[in-house]
């Protein structure tokens, strides 16, 4: 006689919401074997018993977690096989904060995995990556675990958050870090990853009167996704003494995008220029506060933007759009940046 369980593992991980069948069968030389599942919770799956076999159907609910035992007997001989069933939830729902990292600032980055089960620090681990390696020098703060607010009762899913204090990101700063969350289950390792773009600062010297960091530029072909998706990051080359600075994209491919220049000597006037062939127009589409309160001059492939009355540029995101195509370039200007006083 032979006693078989399929799948044969003694531990089985089942994704929440998915079903699994465990078939236990036994052949018997002296007639029909008796096969049944025991140690079942009333809620643990459903059992279909046939001559010489028994099928346990697990529905992928958290209540299905348990250790049923299949018992098979043939005459005076009996066999048994236990299966530890672990139902897990690990959707690709990572949220990182902040949305962008600013080099040169002592900052905390957090990564939250939502709707997790089991909420066990031994099975869930977080890592902050630079490329494929753990970021050296990051300091892990205490992890947090909170129960998610659920619409349905009896589904205690959790969100787990890990925070890190970042080391200096170096010069030049890397284009991005990644939060990686790994769930380690019996014979199963699952990983999700979320990018945290690093804003690249201009590399020219600071003007004498700046009291905070320089502006940062990033480009994206989609306005709506600029905050949540991977971005082509641009940097500003150095060319003292503070002339108009033109962004240069780090990626060699992709659509042709507008360029934003800053004229530090003209009271922080911004110029957006189309960088492609003829027939392209540009316009300012976003500025902190109300765009209507700014002074705008638009002339085909060039568009100027300045503050009224003349003064320091307001803190926040500025965006210029190029048509046709809809490509945009975003510029972030930190607060308290004062124009260069030319001597």
């Amino acid at each position: 006689q032979s006693f078989q369980v399929n799948p044969p593992e003694s531990e089985v991980a089942v994704a929440m919401g998915t079903s699994l069948q465990i078939t236990c069968s036994m052949s018997c030389d002296e007639g029909v074997a008796r096969v049944h599942w025991r140690g079942l919770d009333t809620s643990l799956g459903s059992v279909q018993t046939l001559p010489g076999s028994s099928i346990l159907s697990v529905r992928g609910m958290l209540s299905d977690t348990g250790t049923p035992v299949c018992v098979g007997s043939c005459g005076s001989r009996s066999f048994q096989h236990s299966v530890k069933i672990l139902v897990y939830a690990f959707p690709d729902q990572l949220v990182v904060s902040p949305e962008f990292l600013v080099p040169g600032q002592d900052q905390v980055v957090s990564c939250t995995a939502h709707n997790i089960w089991p909420a066990d620090p031994n099975s869930l681990s977080f890592a902050l990556l630079l490329g494929e390696q753990r970021l050296e020098g990051a300091q892990a703060l205490e992890p947090e675990q909170e129960e998610e607010i659920q619409e349905a009762e009896g589904t205690p899913l959790f969100r787990m958050t890990q925070r890190w204090r970042l080391p200096s990101l170096g010069t030049p700063a890397p284009p991005a870090l990644h939060c990686q969350v790994t769930m380690q289950l019996p014979k199963l390792v699952l990983t999700h990853r979320k990018e945290i773009p690093v804003l690249q600062s201009q590399t020219s010297p600071k003007p004498p009167n700046t009291t905070s960091a320089e502006p940062y530029i990033l480009t994206s072909s989609s306005t709506a996704e600029a905050v949540s998706t991977g971005l082509n990051i641009t940097t500003l080359p150095s060319a003292p003494p503070y002339p108009k600075l033109s962004p240069r994209t780090l990626s060699s491919e992709g659509p042709c995008r507008p360029k934003i220049h800053q004229d530090l000597e003209a009271g922080w006037e911004l110029l957006c220029e189309a960088s492609c062939g003829p027939g392209v127009t540009v316009r300012w589409t976003l500025a902190p506060g109300d765009l209507a309160t700014y002074h705008k001059r638009e002339a085909g492939a060039q568009a100027w933007l300045s503050v009224l009355p003349p003064g320091p540029m307001v803190e926040g995101w500025f965006q210029c759009r190029q048509d046709p195509g809809g490509e945009v370039t975003n510029l972030y200007v930190p607060g308290q940046v004062t124009p260069n006083s030319s001597s």
Partner: antibody
Framework: EVQLLESGGGLVQPGGSLRLSCAAS????????MHWVRQAPGKGLEWVSY????????NYADSVKGRFTISRDNSKNTLYLQMNSLRAEDTAVYYC????????????WGKGTTVTVSS | DIQMTQSPSSLSASVGDRVTITCRAS??????LAWYQQKPGKAPKLLIY???SLQSGVPSRFSGSGSGTDFTLTISSLQPEDFATYYC?????????FGQGTKVEIK
């Protein structure tokens, strides 16, 4: 010169409260995460609590969670530790300390203030 | 929590001796380790940070090495003012933890 000067220690009965202060000078206080570290008589160093530069992040050792509260007043360059429900095992020298951005080692320590919990 | 184990807990040495103190972490802490010196009645003083970097103003006879879980503090030639208690500390993750200390006494 960078300096940290603790005050507020003393003798208190079990169950009592005490508030420690730490006056900082010689550096931009609001840019630094600050810590309290304690040392029981004849024992080693034990980290107690931290607070971030803006005060937005705090954390505590399990042994003091729910009883101690760390806070700071950046306008006064002062760090505080409010200690409630004190126990005999809280008896120690309490040091105020600063850690360095990007490195996170504790590079500056105060001279310490002694807290004695006894009836 | 990450446990830090120092050895020896105490040692006797003479002026001019080479002294080595070891510190072991219960899990990898990369290079997030500092060494402190403390004299009786005084606050600790930072000697080494990032496992092997000498803090400004600290004599070059002090050196640190190691990465991952095993670390060493070496005093190349012990001076009279070096008799003190030395602590290692990991700051890779919270709660930050200290070794139990190594007391260096005069032989």
């Amino acid at each position: 010169e960078v300096q940290l000067l603790e005050s507020g220690g003393g003798l208190v009965q079990p169950g009592g409260s005490l508030r420690l202060s730490c006056a900082a000078s010689g550096f931009t206080f609001s840019s630094y995460w600050m810590h309290w570290v304690r040392q029981a008589p004849g024992k080693g160093l034990e980290w107690v609590s931290y607070i971030s530069g803006s005060g937005g992040y705090t954390n505590y050792a399990d042994s003091v969670k729910g009883r101690f509260t760390i806070s700071r007043d950046n306008s006064k360059n002062t760090l505080y530790l409010q200690m409630n429900s004190l126990r005999a095992e809280d008896t120690a020298v309490y040091y105020c300390a600063r850690d360095r951005p990007y490195y996170y080692d504790i590079d500056v320590w105060g001279k310490g203030t002694t807290v004695t919990v006894s009836s | 929590d990450i446990q830090m184990t120092q050895s020896p807990s105490s040692l006797s040495a003479s002026v001019g001796d080479r002294v080595t103190i070891t510190c072991r972490a219960s899990q990898s802490i990369s290079s997030s380790l500092a060494w402190y010196q403390q004299k009786p009645g005084k606050a600790p003083k930072l000697l080494i940070y990032a496992a092997s970097s000498l803090q400004s103003g600290v004599p070059s006879r002090f050196s640190g090495s190691g990465s991952g879980t095993d670390f060493t503090l070496t005093i190349s030639s012990l001076q009279p003012e070096d008799f003190a208690t030395y602590y290692c500390q990991q700051y890779k993750s919270y709660p930050v933890t200290f070794g139990q200390g190594t007391k260096v006494e005069i032989k």
